[in-house]
Interface confidence: medium
């Protein structure tokens, strides 16, 4: 069984399905947001280019105790070929630029939708 985002599915998950499910989760986060997401925690901004999945995970993994993004963290790990742990710093991060998690999620969502629309699933 392949487990993606906490849901078991029979056999490998097609890349298009995995990306769509990640988009769905980010949509849910943005639409269901009541209080400031993750108590207004700040994360490193990233360049939305090749390797951005790992960079996004490296940023978000430094946010602890925020259940709202735990599923997103798990899903992003499925897109990143190497193990990511807290404290890692990628060259894709925009140095000295931090943004709120809520804005990070919105920016990532818009970019992932663009990739989905263009058929760039990997």
């Amino acid at each position: 069984l392949t487990c993606l985002g906490g849901f078991a599915s029979p056999g490998p998950v097609p890349p298009s399905t995995a990306l769509r499910e990640l988009i769905e989760e980010l949509v849910n986060i943005t639409q269901n947001q009541k209080a400031p997401l993750c108590n207004g925690s700040m994360v490193w901004s990233i360049n939305l280019t090749a390797g951005m999945y790992c960079a996004a995970l490296e940023s978000l993994i430094n946010v602890s105790g925020c259940s709202a993004i735990e599923k997103t963290q798990r899903m992003l790990s499925g897109f990143c070929p190497h193990k990511v742990s807290a404290g890692q710093f990628s060259s894709l991060h925009v140095r000295d630029t931090k943004i709120e998690v809520a804005q990070f999620v919105k920016d990532l969502l818009l970019h992932l939708k663009k990739l989905f629309r263009e058929g760039q699933f990997n």
Epitope: E24, V27, N28, Q31, K113, K114, R117
Partner: nanobody, 117 residues
């Protein structure tokens, strides 16, 4: 209270066309992604198409790409699905849903589309 009411389903011959509508109420329609999903007899839910709340950009499952067109009229709080070149395998109950893909929080009662000669 959020309500989604689908209409436009029916019996159509293979190769024919149908236009489904979904009247939405109870929320700010223009601000949300909307989707169509379907359930064929004896099968699970299948995502068909989504449209952004703003943009609007559209997204399609490979099985309907080039045949189906999703659109919306925010002034009428209505979502549409134009279905052309229908096939027997398109037979299903079609649901309008608030959200993207299958990650929706509200959906309608559905409208049955039967493609048969």
């Amino acid at each position: 209270e959020v309500q989604l009411l689908e209409s436009g389903g029916g019996l159509v011959q293979p190769g024919g066309s149908l236009r489904l509508s979904c009247a939405a109420s109870g929320f700010t329609f223009g601000g949300y992604d909307m989707s169509w999903v379907r359930q064929a007899p004896g099968k699970g839910l299948e995502w068909v198409s989504s449209i952004d709340g703003v943009g609007p950009h559209t997204y399609y499952a490979d099985s309907v790409k080039g045949r189906f067109t999703i659109s919306r009229d925010n002034s009428k709080n209505t979502l549409y699905l134009q279905m052309n070149s229908l096939r027997a395998e398109d037979t299903a109950v079609y649901y309008c849903a608030k959200g993207f893909g299958l990650g929706f929080d509200y959906w309608g009662q559905g409208t049955l589309v039967t493609v048969s000669s």
